[in-house]
């Protein structure tokens, strides 16, 4: 359990308050983290509070600027990098955003041997994405879909490849779909350890569908945004990957790597790029159907001047239970030997840990074991494995750091978070330096987060990087809502739950029961983290309860409940959150008269079944950008889960889980649906589905559109959204204004 | 406040060798990352070589295998030896740390290799 302190006395009662919907929209009560820009094994760069950028050395204990906020300022820059050689920065200006991650922008190189920026061969804008090599300086950059290379900053620039167009062919950038749902990067281009090879991927749209929707602007027409977005089922980009020579890229040009004979016999994708030395390379791809990922090693044949992939270094990884991986296929941590590598994935026990293949998959060696999970390994150094799980006294929601001694046998494990702030701090995260010399660790809650510096040798706790007193004092005087995380038992199930409870909680009253879910695959709502955002405002300020239960198809409990909703989305998901309902209703303390239900994205989608499952234990609920029917979304997301929708595979269940077939059971409920009409991801076309379906069965309910808005509904249209849901949501629940 | 001094600089015969020196001072460590920088008459600072905190060294292409950055933290000191000096190496070289210390240059020492 789980209590966040309320700090109630009756003597100080009066000096104590409520949380705004003010508080939570002007972001009055939000943390910070500290995250260092690691230069070396002992040194890190910072951006002061003023905007110098400052060097710290551990080990001296000295820091200095090594850019002032001026030069900052003199091109309006909001990023920066130092080069690798340390002789030059880019500055990074004009920031426009594109999808989750990508962005263009403008560079500038600041040259710090004589203060100036470079003059001549000046980079060209916007460009898509740039980098620094990892030793010296050279720069690799995309531009107009296309790859460059300079060898200096000042040096004209080499260009790598030519056919590059808009929407059509992507070099060295991700298209929508692996950008979103494969890549999660900005950028599809590797460096080699030390720079001599440059690896890219190349993206072929030509033949996906385009999904078209307006843009309304202040135009006197609007524009129509066309984004290449492979539906499930549709035709997919057609990937390759690339490596060149950087230190003489005209010599044989970009070569191709092989796709392994066992992936290219039909549709695939390509997953991820480890570099393992400056001439050997591990690629990982998958099957178009999701349970099969084949990892390769390649190496690089001076004689052809080409990359040999031997089928003695492919391993293959397959899921007969459900698909490869949890959200993504993990990828590779490669020990010191250049071939042998640590990955977390399924033992026999259905529990994700960590291997270790020196082979073969089949001789893998487990290194963790336990009905727990590993969750992501961090560094691997000579003698240590850094990596973090929620073993510690098998709370799911919570991550701690161990340390698994590999340098001894037989290996010793130690955490080494979970006795440091025990009460504070159940979550963790953390940044290694070079040779994990040193290492930040960030710790996200339950208590107010606090970011600390560490010994890579002692794990002494050498200084606190950021405290947040500035959050905990604006906290003293605020009546914070309690929190417990528990479980309950329901047919061999096991559901985490998360309920937040007004400050002056009594359970022998009835109070207003809010919802929150997600409940996507591989997803998890009920984490051990520190916020106040708008459901801690509810409880706090309006005296709702709030649950956030994690059901079947959530993550890091183990692949029983990972996989019970796969090829059948939008069953269980659902049938557990309203398990979990009738449970908290036996508690005693829940108005059963006003239950709601809200969610967002896949949450919508699940608020949405719920709403519409005929069990009368909702009175209302809210959409906000839900999918509604899976064949209107992304390929690679959906038939990971769904399989394909073709008559032969899935088709049915495509169906019968759309939100629209079950339009007639909305009408006993109050609905509110609320979408973006830019929304990239979850196309606006979902929610206007449901709304003629609704209107077709002539099915009351409530809308809410926000134009030119994409999936997450930011800036004003924020503050928009959440007053109109705050006052649906009173309404419903009979509170008064 | 930070100061770095830099000494040795001279006239030389191309073909000759220098060892220049920087004491650190000010409460300026010299373990930080340090490097040589240099610049010639009518051009613009340029860098010549680095030693990390951790002891790696790395050079300009213009001066590798001929100059030599070293340290000794007993005296809070960097060193670069020059061998095999050419005319073109004629400037005026700075120490500083690396990545340098913003508007933080000392007066530097001059080295004129002639021919």
């Known amino acids: 359990i789980v209590l966040r302190p309320s700090r109630v006395h009756n003597s100080e009662e009066n000096t104590m308050r409520a949380l705004t919907l003010k508080d939570i929209l002007n972001g009055t009560f939000s943390y910070k983290t500290f995250f260092p820009n690691w230069i070396s094994g002992q040194e890190y760069l910072h951006q002061s509070a003023d905007n110098n950028i400052v060097l710290y050395n551990i080990e001296t204990g000295q820091s200095y600027t090594i850019l002032s906020n001026r030069t900052m300022k003199s091109v309006n820059a909001s990023n920066y990098g130092l080069s690798p050689d340390r002789q030059f920065v880019y500055l990074e200006s004009d920031y426009s955003k594109l999808w989750r991650y990508s962005y263009t922008a403008t560079y500038y190189i600041y040259d710090l041997s004589n203060g100036e920026f470079v003059r001549g061969n000046e980079l060209p804008r916007p460009i898509q994405y740039l980098c620094w090599s990892p030793v010296g300086s050279k720069l690799a950059y995309v531009y107009q879909n296309n790859i460059y290379l300079k060898q200096r900053p000042g040096d004209p620039p080499f260009q790598i490849t030519f056919n590059g167009r808009e929407n059509k062919i992507f070099n060295g950038i991700p298209d929508w779909v692996y950008e979103e749902e494969m890549l999660a990067t900005k950028y599809a281009l590797w460096w080699s350890p030390n720079g001599k090879f440059l690896a890219y991927a190349e993206f072929n749209d030509t033949d996906i569908p385009v999904i078209a929707y307006s843009y309304y602007g202040d135009e006197q027409y609007p524009r129509t945004i066309n984004i290449p977005y492979p539906k499930a089922g549709a035709k997919n980009p057609v990937v390759r990957i690339f490596i060149i020579d950087t230190t003489y890229p005209a010599y044989v040009g970009p070569q191709e790597v092989p796709v392994p004979a066992m992936i290219a016999s039909s549709d695939y994708y390509f997953s991820w790029l480890t570099w393992v030395t400056d001439e050997r390379v591990c690629l990982q791809w998958l099957k178009r159907v999701q349970n099969v990922s084949v990892l390769s090693i390649c190496d690089f044949r001076e004689d052809w001047q080409t990359w040999d992939c031997p089928k003695t270094q492919e391993h293959i990884e397959e899921s007969r239970t459900g698909w490869a991986g949890g959200f993504f296929v993990s990828t590779p941590v490669f020990s010191y030997d250049a071939i042998s590598y640590y990955k977390i994935f399924s033992d026999k026990d259905g529990y994700k840990h960590i291997h270790y293949i020196k082979d073969t998959v089949e001789n893998a060696i487990q290194i963790t074991s336990g009905k727990w999970e590993a969750i992501n390994i961090f560094r691997v150094t000579q003698d240590s494995l850094f990596y973090s799980s929620n073993e510690f006294e098998e709370y799911p929601g919570r991550r701690n750091i161990y340390r698994i001694s590999i340098g001894s046998y037989p290996p010793s494990k130690k955490c080494v978070t979970c006795h440091l702030r025990k009460e504070r701090c159940q979550y963790y995260t953390a940044s290694f330096s070079d040779y994990a010399k040193y290492y930040a660790l960030v710790c996200y809650g339950p208590g107010i987060p606090i970011s600390t510096l560490h010994d890579g040798r002692t794990d002494q706790e050498i200084k606190i990087l950021e405290e947040n007193k500035e959050l905990e004092n604006a906290l003293k005087n605020i009546q914070l809502p309690k929190e417990e995380i528990k479980k309950l038992e329901v047919d061999e199930i096991t559901l985490w739950y998360k309920m937040i409870l007004p400050p002056q909680f009594d359970r022998s009253k009835k109070y207003p029961l809010l919802i929150q879910v997600y409940g996507g695959p591989c997803s998890q709502s009920v984490r051990s983290v520190f916020a106040v955002n708008w459901i801690s405002y509810l409880a706090s300020k309006e005296g709702m309860v709030i649950a956030l239960v994690d059901g079947r198809g959530t993550a890091f409990q183990g692949d029983k409940l990972l996989y019970a909703v796969y090829r059948k989305l939008g069953v269980y998901e659902v049938e557990d959150q309203i398990t979990a309902v009738r449970k908290f209703i036996e508690m005693g303390f829940i108005d059963e008269k006003r239950i709601a239900i809200w969610g967002w994205s896949y949450g919508g989608y699940v608020s949405s079944l719920a709403l519409a499952s005929g069990t009368g234990l909702f009175k209302c609920g809210i959409a906000v950008a839900p999918v509604s029917s899976w064949e209107y979304y992304a390929s690679v997301y959906t038939e990971r889960f769904m399989g394909l929708p073709t008559k032969d595979d899935n088709l049915e269940h495509y169906k019968n889980s759309t939100v629209m077939a079950r339009a007639e059971y909305f009408r006993n409920v109050d609905y509110l649906l609320i979408h973006g009409t830019a929304d990239d991801n979850v196309h606006f076309q979902n929610s206007a589905q449901i709304a003629k379906a609704l209107v077709n069965a002539q099915v009351d309910f409530q809308a809410m559109w926000y134009s030119d808005q994409n999936h997450g509904l930011s800036g004003l249209s924020t503050n928009h959204l959440y007053t109109h849901m705050t006052h649906f949501l009173k309404q419903c629940f009979s509170l008064s204004d | 406040q930070v100061q770095l001094q830099e000494s040795g600089g001279g006239l030389v015969q191309a073909g000759g060798s220098l060892r220049l020196s920087c004491a650190a001072s000010g409460g300026f460590d010299s373990r930080n990352a340090m490097g040589w920088y240099r610049q010639a008459p009518g051009k613009r600072r340029e860098w010549v070589a680095t030693?990390?905190?951790?002891?790696?060294?790395n050079y300009a292409d213009s001066v590798k295998a001929r100059f030599t950055i070293s340290r000794d933290n007993s005296k809070n000191t960097v060193y670069l030896q020059m061998n095999s000096l050419k005319p073109e190496d004629t400037a005026v070289y700075y120490c500083n740390a690396a990545p340098p210390i913003f508007g933080s240059w000392g007066q530097g020492t001059q080295v004129t290799v002639s021919s």
């Open positions: 030693i990390t905190s951790d002891g790696r060294t």
